[in-house]
Interface confidence: low
């Protein structure tokens, strides 16, 4: 019969013959022949392969380096890589999470729109009219100006995006 030009799913072509791929978590030891099947071996400790494959070496699990602010979010198996995340107060610098940086703080005049996670930084927004932030913070939102009227007071000093209004008593001397 004619040698195949394509193989079935979970097979690969070698020496004009289709051989079974190794299952996830195992590496290739030797290709099949017509009298012996593909030989595969399980990946070792701290190694993985996450696909049906013909790799002769397993990949090393990612190392979550604490010196870079990293910690293990999910321990790797023979079929999955280790997932790293950042320590509290830090976030990943990339999707691969190879290192961490401190969460950004929102300066005075800006409030936190979205609090940072292990994989995304703080998102800040300028405080709109009627709101202010007088601190540099990674958690504080813009606060609304104090309503002097509800306290039966009057505005003595207008608020800004960085300062609250200053309220004072009403001037009762005028008739």
């Amino acid at each position: 019969p004619e040698p195949p030009t394509a193989c079935r799913e979970k097979q690969y072509l070698i020496n004009s013959q289709c051989c079974s791929l190794c299952q996830p978590g195992q590496k290739l030891v030797s290709d099949c022949t017509e009298f012996t099947e593909t030989e595969c071996l399980p990946c070792g400790e701290s190694e993985f392969l996450d696909t049906w494959n013909r790799e002769t070496h397993c990949h090393q699990h990612k190392y979550c380096d604490p010196n870079l602010g990293l910690r293990v979010q999910q321990k790797g198996t023979s079929e999955t890589d280790t997932i790293c995340t950042c320590e509290e107060g830090w976030h990943c610098t990339s999707e691969a999470c190879e290192s961490c940086v401190l969460h950004r703080s929102c300066s005075p005049g800006f409030g936190v729109k979205q609090i940072a996670t292990g994989v995304s930084d703080t998102i800040c927004e300028p405080c709109p009219v009627g709101f202010f932030s007088n601190v540099s913070s990674a958690f504080e939102k813009c606060h609304p100006w104090t309503s002097c009227e509800t306290k039966d007071l009057v505005v003595q000093q207008a608020g800004t995006n960085k300062t609250d209004v200053v309220c004072g008593p009403q001037d009762r001397l005028r008739a």
């Epitope: 019969p1 040698p3 195949p4 193989c7 079935r8 979970k10 097979q11 072509l13 004009s16 013959q17 289709c18 051989c19 079974s20 791929l21 190794c22 299952q23 195992q26 099949c32 022949t33 017509e34 009298f35 012996t36 099947e37 593909t38 030989e39 595969c40």
Partner: antibody
Framework: QVQLVESGGGVVQPGRSLRLSCAAS????????MHWVRQAPGKGLEWVAV????????YHADSVKGRFTISRDNSKNALYLQMNSLRVEDTAVYYC???????????????????WGQGTTVTVSS | DIVLTQSPLSLPVTPGEPASISCRSS???????????LDWYLQKPGQSPQLLIY???NRASGVPDRFSGSGSGTDFTLKISRLEAEDVGVYYC?????????FGQGTKVEIK
């Protein structure tokens, strides 16, 4: 019909050589991997060697490695086992065996060792 | 190398009665394509071995349906539903997953 016939056995002294032959008929010999399996008197079956259909791949049991060589001649539909430096423990009936398979889309689906010869007796004795 | 251990080594059976032989492997014979690479062979007195079962549970051509193979991974069983006089002989399991091929020690089935 499908048949394997071994020949070449006999009585031989330790250290001497012998060449076993296996004549295949009734099937396309060049499409099959072939094995030699032996059986010492009153003992179980022991695998000896295997050769791929084109003769490109060969494996031998550790017990015979370096002394025995499996080979084939597809033009003659013949399998061979060259046995050198024979030992008393090589005394056995030697069987020529076909590795059955079913070829589907290039993949050899194993069907067992489906055809066995009648065996040829090798006696190594001083 | 893979080691196969058969039990029992001797099995006297009354004709018409069932018989069961076990074969245990030192490592899994379940391959990634879903097949168990274990065969069963019968060697009748004075004859060459013959194939009974391949890939764990597939009966070879011409083998009566009173023979059946089962099991997966490391534990396998050959069953004869009703023993007949012509079934006597030595039964061997063999792993076909790796080279070198290895056989069990054999189980001698005889008439009780």
């Amino acid at each position: 019909q499908v048949q394997l016939v071994e020949s070449g056995g006999g009585v031989v002294q330790p250290g001497r050589s012998l060449r076993l032959s296996c004549a295949a008929s009734g099937f396309t010999f060049s499409s099959y991997g072939m094995h030699w399996v032996r059986q010492a008197p009153g003992k179980g079956l022991e695998w000896v060697a295997v050769i791929s259909k084109d003769g490109g791949n060969k494996y031998h049991a550790d017990s015979v490695k370096g002394r025995f060589t499996i080979s084939r001649d597809n033009s003659k539909n013949a399998l061979y086992l060259q046995m050198n430096s024979l030992r008393v423990e090589d005394t056995a009936v030697y069987y020529c065996v076909r590795r059955g398979h079913q070829l589907v889309l290039g993949y050899y689906y194993y069907n067992g060792l489906d055809v066995w010869g009648q065996g040829t007796t090798v006696t190594v004795s001083s | 190398d893979i080691v196969l251990t058969q039990s029992p080594l001797s099995l006297p059976v009354t004709p018409g009665e069932p018989a069961s032989i076990s074969c245990r492997s030192s490592q899994s014979l379940l391959y990634s394509n879903g097949y168990n690479f274990l065969d069963w062979y019968l060697q009748k007195p004075g004859q060459s071995p013959q194939l009974l079962i391949y890939l764990g549970s597939n009966r070879a051509s011409g083998v009566p349906d009173r023979f059946s193979g089962s099991g997966s991974g490391t534990d396998f069983t050959l069953k004869i539903s009703r023993l007949e006089a012509e079934d006597v002989g030595v039964y061997y399991c063999m792993q076909a997953l790796q080279t070198p091929r290895t056989f069990g020690q054999g189980t001698k089935v005889e008439i009780k």
